[in-house]
């Protein structure tokens, strides 16, 4: 039975040019985490495996950065980066976890980062 | 260098049995999700088997869930595919495949070949 | 599970052409798509994974683009060496599925 739930930092804002970190957390499970994926609508960004580290996808190596932790960093953000970001979580024994983080690249520069919440 | 070596095939009658086995070295074997997949003569590639490399899970192609075992041997850095009650369709080569994240298939073996046939 | 169709299933053409194979997924699959290339009497060789990242190794007239369900395999000039049947594949869920296979022939 699953009994973790996934807190991410929810919907938050950043400016254009700037950086700002994707983070979730998984708690209530003692399941062990063996990978965290990290997707942005369609596309791989990255995966975090135990054992082999971090990979970043190739197309994306010069604006995203591994950590902090399991979080992923995202540079030089273009309004075009406004979306759905995704991380899953493969957990042994439990599967599979997913949290969602929406993310709006403001020109301005009034971006307030949004409430944390979680997912179950 | 990255290396897999499979062995184990041969000639078998329909209803028989095989065990694959799939010797690899030049990387730390226990690392990585690992892969069975087949090639009937003239035809496509099809997935087998596949197993996770921290939990053990195991994951079957429908055509052989409950004939086949996929297993692995960390200290012996070695992949199996045991084979019971084998049918005609199953004959192949057989290939083992290392599979980095479970996300793709970047080494192959050279494949052994299954034949079924009385 | 989830259908991977290829096209087409031949091809013939010249050295030096530009040369395109598409994959489509019965269901989205993210860029959980990969492309691999085959030779007779060879084990499939990995060129493309995710989608788009080239595999180390593999030369620069390759590439790959796509997600969702549609997907894309460009050879942008066709080599005597690039002859032979190309594989997609899908990694977003168990079963593991590959499309049908494109082989590429000399025109």
């Known amino acids: 039975m699953m009994t973790g739930t996934i807190e991410t930092t929810g919907n938050i804002s950043a400016e254009k040019g700037g950086s700002i970190i994707l983070q979730c957390h998984l708690s209530s499970t003692t399941a062990q985490v063996t990978q965290v994926n990290w997707e942005q609508q369609d596309q791989l960004l990255a995966i975090c495996n135990a054992d082999l580290g971090w990979h970043i996808s190739p197309s994306f190596k010069d604006r995203v950065a591994p950590g902090p932790g399991l979080g992923l960093t995202l540079q030089s953000l273009t309004v075009n980066d406004t979306g759905e970001y995704f991380c899953i979580y493969h957990t042994y024994p439990d599967g599979t976890y997913t949290g969602r983080i929406f993310l709006e690249v403001l020109e301005s520069s009034v971006a307030e980062h949004g409430a944390r919440f979680q997912i179950p | 260098e990255v290396q897999l070596l499979e062995s184990g095939g041969g000639l078998v009658q329909p209803g028989g049995s095989l065990r694959l086995s799939c010797a690899a070295s030049?990387?730390?074997?226990?690392?990585?999700?690992m892969n069975w997949v087949r090639q009937a003569p003239g035809k496509g590639l099809e997935w087998v088997a596949g197993?996770?490399?921290?939990?053990?899970?195991?994951y079957y192609a429908d055509s052989v869930k409950g004939r086949f075992t996929i297993s692995r041997d960390n200290s012996k850095n070695t992949l199996y595919l045991q084979m019971n009650s084998l049918r005609a369709e199953d004959t192949a080569v057989y290939y083992c495949a290392r599979g980095p994240y479970d996300v793709w298939m970047d080494y192959w073996g050279q494949g052994t070949l299954v034949t079924v046939s009385s | 599970d989830i259908q991977m169709t290829q096209s087409p299933s031949s091809l013939s053409a010249s050295v030096g052409d530009r040369v395109t194979i598409t994959c489509r997924a019965s269901q989205s699959i993210s860029s959980y798509l990969n492309w691999y290339q085959q030779k007779p009497g060879k084990a499939p060789k990995l060129l493309i994974y995710?989608?788009?990242s080239l595999q180390s190794g593999v030369p620069s007239r390759f590439s790959g683009s796509g997600s969702g369900t549609d997907f894309t395999l460009t050879i942008s000039s066709l080599q005597p060496e690039d002859f032979a049947t190309y594989y997609c594949q899908q990694s977003y869920s168990t079963p593991l599925t590959f499309g049908g296979g494109t082989k590429v022939e000399i025109k």
């Open positions: 197993i996770k490399y921290s939990s053990g899970n195991k």
């Open positions: 995710a989608a788009s």
């Open positions: 030049g990387f730390t074997f226990s690392s990585y999700g």
